[in-house]
């Protein structure tokens, strides 16, 4: 329901700051609240646009504040308007100068049709001028200067709706800024009547509440609530459910509350006077202190709440026995709830006396739809209403309101619901690799449609054309291996993402199909890889005798170690070798093979070989001569890979002897990296050279090494390869 309240803080303007605050309490207007000048009520008022700002202390409130220097521009009539679902509600009020010649008895006056009415203004300044009275800015009445009474009155013996309006009084020489205003509200119906034809009976609107002539509902004064305004609010609170609070040091002092017609304006309970800054006299309470306490049994009268009944008594005058009523309170309802789209069962829990019934608890959606409990239970202290929303969707996000309305009063608790879209992967998972009983899957969980964060991921799989249920595994990484699959079987795969919260399982994403391999043959036996030339390698294997009648072939995969160059070659199954050609000289290749039928076989281990070199080999490196004795020495070296080095030659001769007197030791296994020279002469200097040979030729040594044998009696020595330039 729409609860719009306009607070006119200091309707009598002096040189102090003054304001208008319009509050939408307990509902969210679909359009902004507007505050404007009410030209209908007063045509010739100031034309300046108002500076309307958001009231930072409240979520749905607008405010106009006039600084003291703007006092001369404030006089006039104002309105606040709110709209929700096509229904507009307008509240009116006025502001006038405190230094006006006359002051009204009240800011507004509500009467019933047919009432005998006196609209009165109190003379505060004596002038030798005629007094004039206007209605909605038009002259209606004057009083000669010598007859202006202390109380200037407009008498309406039989008020009619057309008599309603803003009445103003001033001296004839004055103007708008010295005028006093009061607004007469005439209910369309006679006392206690309501309805389009005014022939329905009003309920009693207690504590100066007013029966709305169109709906029969009571408009409750600030500080009271409930269907008949019987229930007093907690101290310094107001609004239909008493959840708005006056923030002033003395509560609602100096706040004039204006409510929708036909209520008009009044002070909050406990206050009176045009500025609402006078406390009630003892024995009086309520708005404008118009209510008199008549408490039974000498109960205490509180100026805000009326009679404070002793335990076991209730009613306005504590005239009824019974457990005192307790305003309902909504408990255990968080301010914010995150909900996954789908089924949702919100719970409203409330206390109070009498305990709220099923019919008294409702849930209001942001669009204004009122929901009623699907399930209800209560304990000694609480009523619990369970609502069911079969399919809640993101547009349902927003402020929901749990509302409890009992004879003891009404309470509403807004809470924010954020409806999340269940996540669903946009892409099907990818199959990276398969075997006869496994598959390696990239689950491709991102990107996904919907809301995160993702709490967990499931990979769902099942064989196609089987009436089996989907199986699933929980997945933490993007890459996952599915094991224990059936060979030669088509499977379908999809991914389901799960977000936090109840019902967070999203719909499975797109489906990917794949087929497992048949059980494969073992790799060829006796595999051997040898270089044939600078551009060819030869792979050989033992003959293959398959166990089944299936056609088979050998698949050879060769790839370069140095370059990203790969080739797969199919070789008929009756052959036992393949020449791998079009290769690069002096390059290392990795080769593997498998035997395939319709199903792929298992790969062999990798074999590695270099193609023959296209250049002379480099000299052996790290040449060292060690363990020298009188007749022997150990010579060691290293050679570089990849130059097709087939042999190493060690050439040595006694220094000073002719070149043709050298000895050559040829080492045909290029993997050998040291050799012991024997049969040397003691105490003799030798010149040692070492060469590498490949398919192109021999390497060219840059210098020779010197070796001096020891005398026969000496221990072995290291020579570190002293160099002698050639």
């Amino acid at each position: 329901a729409m609860d719009l309240i306009l607070i006119n803080s200091l309707p009598l303007v002096s040189d102090a700051e003054t304001s208008l605050t319009c509050i939408a309490s307990g509902w969210r207007p679909h359009e902004p609240i507007t505050i404007g000048r009410d030209f209908e009520a007063l045509m010739n008022q100031h034309q300046d646009p108002l500076e309307v700002t958001q009231d930072v202390t409240r979520e749905w409130a607008k405010k106009v504040v006039w600084k003291r220097e703007k006092a001369s521009k404030i006089n006039g009539a104002y309105f606040c308007e709110g709209r929700v679902r096509g229904e507009a509600i307008r509240i009116r009020t006025m502001k006038m100068r405190q230094q006006a010649s006359f002051l009204p008895a009240t800011l507004t006056m509500t009467v019933d049709k047919g009432d005998n009415v006196n609209i009165s203004f109190k003379k505060v300044l004596i002038k030798e001028e005629d007094a004039v009275i206007y209605k909605n800015g038009s002259f209606i009445h004057s009083v000669p200067r010598h007859e202006v009474p202390d109380i200037l009155e407009v008498h309406l013996p039989h008020a009619q709706p057309q008599d309603a309006g803003v009445y103003s009084a001033r001296y004839i020489g004055g103007n708008l800024f010295t005028s006093a205003f009061t607004r007469l509200i005439v209910r369309r119906c006679e006392a206690q009547k309501w309805g389009p034809e005014c022939n329905h009976l009003c309920t009693a609107c207690m504590n100066n509440g007013v029966c709305h002539e169109d709906t029969g509902e009571c408009i409750c004064p600030p500080g009271f609530m409930g269907r008949t305004c019987e229930k007093a609010c907690e101290l310094h609170t107001f609004g239909r459910t008493c959840k708005e609070r006056c923030s002033g040091q003395e509560g609602c002092k100096s706040y004039v509350f204006c409510l929708p017609d036909p209520y008009g304006c009044s002070c909050a309970t406990g206050w009176k006077g045009l500025q609402c800054n006078e406390a009630c006299h003892p024995g009086f309470y309520g708005p404008d202190c118009k209510l008199r306490c008549s408490c039974n049994n000498g109960e205490m009268c509180d100026r805000f709440q009326g009679c404070l009944c002793s335990p076991g008594w209730q009613g306005l005058q504590c005239e009824r026995e019974g457990i005192p009523r307790m305003t309902p309170k909504i408990v255990d309802l968080p301010d914010h709830i995150e909900v996954n789209s789908g089924k949702f069962n919100p719970i409203c829990k409330a206390s109070g006396w009498p305990l709220p019934t099923n019919e008294e608890m409702t849930l209001v959606k942001p669009d204004g739809t009122v929901l009623h409990p699907k399930d209800f239970n209560h304990t000694d202290h609480f009523s619990v209403a369970i609502f069911t929303i079969h399919r809640i969707l993101p547009p349902d996000s927003g402020v929901w309101v749990c509302s409890v309305n009992t004879v003891a009063g009404m309470v509403e608790k807004p809470f924010n619901i954020s409806v999340k879209v269940l996540p669903k992967p946009l892409n099907a998972p990818n199959v990276i690799d398969t075997g006869h009983n496994f598959a390696v899957i990239n689950i491709s969980s991102e990107p996904y449609f919907g809301d995160g964060p993702i709490k967990s991921k499931k990979l769902l799989y099942k064989p196609v054309n089987h009436y089996e249920a989907w199986q699933h595994i929980q997945v933490t990484n993007e890459i996952v291996t599915l094991n224990y699959l059936e060979p030669r079987t088509e499977y379908e795969l999809c991914v389901q993402l799960v977000r936090r919260g109840e019902g967070g399982e999203g719909h499975p994403g797109p489906v990917r199909r794949f087929t497992t391999a048949s059980i494969g043959l073992p790799p060829p036996r006796g595999l051997n890889l040898l270089p044939k030339s600078q551009t060819t390698l030869n792979l050989t294997w033992q003959p293959i005798f398959p166990s089944s009648e299936d056609d088979f072939y050998v698949e050879v995969e060769r790839r370069s170690v140095q370059k990203s160059d790969q080739q797969n070659i199919k070789v008929p199954g009756n052959l036992t070798s393949v020449l791998l050609n079009n290769l690069h000289p002096r390059e290392q290749y990795v080769v593997r093979a498998r035997v395939n039928t319709k199903a792929q076989g298992e790969w062999s281990e990798d074999l590695t070989a270099w193609t023959l070199s296209d250049i002379l080999p480099p000299q052996p490196e790290n040449i060292k001569i060690s363990n020298i004795t009188h007749s022997s020495a150990v010579i060691s070296w290293t050679i570089l890979d990849g130059y097709s080095i087939s042999s190493i030659t060690i050439r040595y001769k006694v220094q000073g002897k002719n070149e043709d007197q050298h000895v050559d030791v040829k080492i045909k296994n290029a993997t050998i990296t040291q050799y012991q020279l024997k049969g040397l002469e003691p105490e003799t200097a030798y010149q040692v050279d070492i060469f590498a040979e490949n398919n192109i030729g021999s390497s060219n040594p840059a210098f020779s090494h010197e070796l001096v044998t020891l005398p026969e009696s000496q221990a072995p020595a290291d020579l570190g390869g002293g160099k002698m330039l050639l």
Partner: antibody, heavy 117, light 113 residues
Framework: QVQLVQSGGGVVQPGRSLRLSCAAS????????MHWVRQAPGKGLEWVAV????????YYADSVKGRFTISRDNSKNMLQLQMNRLRSEDTAVYYC??????????WGQGTVITVSS | DIQMTQSPDSLAVSLGERATINCKSS????????????LAWYQQKPGQPPNLLMY???TRESGVPDRFSGSGSGTDFTLTISSLQAEDVAVYYC?????????FGQGTRLEIK
């Protein structure tokens, strides 16, 4: 829990009188206008009378005007319907009810009145 | 007095199907000042008092399932039960409160087909 408990029904001869009562609990009875509605056997609903919360205003259906009187005792939370000069067409189930605006929200359980010689 | 006429007098609908009851007033019950229709709907089960379902023509009373909805304006109104349940078997009445005396329609008996 708001409840309206009715009593006083029975069989009565034409031309005789009968008094129906309706006891209210769970609401501030003195704040609410109260209605009587009747339903003849196998027929629809017919509004009979209404009384204001303070008993000052009373209205009747044309069919019962001058014969029926609606009254209330707020100190006892009690509503009454005094039915005089009963006719056979007054035979019905009589309900008391509290309004919610112009609709009738809370109903008594009903009491059967049979006017027959 | 404003006369209220309901149609049909009786209606048989299968479980889960939509049920529609119409109500016509002899004069408009729409009040232009607030754009409200002064019309209520009641459900009455055998041996029980009527139970308020709707007021202002389309506002559901507390505790009434949301399969019940009210529509219409001026002189023509409809009560719709979107998916009939076994417990909805009853007599349904419309009532105007635009003007006193309040008046009811003659009722529509709803049964299961």
């Amino acid at each position: 829990q708001v409840q309206l408990v009715q009593s006083g029904g029975g069989v009565v001869q034409p031309g005789r009188s009968l008094r129906l009562s309706c006891a209210a609990s769970g609401l501030t009875f003195s704040n609410y206008a109260m209605h009587w509605v009747r339903q003849a056997p196998g027929k629809g609903l017919e509004w009979v009378a209404v009384i204001s919360y303070d008993g000052e205003n009373k209205y009747y259906a044309d069919s019962v005007k001058g014969r029926f009187t609606i009254s209330r005792d707020n100190s006892k939370n009690m509503l009454q319907l005094q039915m005089n000069r009963l006719r056979s067409e007054d035979t019905a189930v009589y309900y008391c009810a509290t309004p919610k605006g112009g609709a009738l929200e809370i109903w008594g359980q009903g009491t059967v009145i049979t006017v027959s010689s | 007095d404003i006369q209220m006429t309901q149609s049909p007098d009786s209606l048989a609908v299968s479980l889960g199907e939509r049920a529609t009851i119409n109500c016509k007033s002899s004069q408009s019950v729409l009040y232009s000042a607030n754009n409200k229709n002064y019309l209520a709907w009641y459900q009455q089960k055998p041996g029980q008092p009527p139970n308020l379902l709707m007021y202002w023509a389309s506002t559901r009373e507390s505790g009434v399932p949301d399969r019940f909805s009210g529509s219409g304006s001026g002189t023509d109104f409809t009560l719709t039960i979107s998916s009939l349940q076994a417990e909805d078997v009853a007599v349904y009445y419309c009532q105007q409160y635009y003007s006193a005396p309040i008046t009811f329609g003659q009722g529509t008996r709803l049964e299961i087909k």
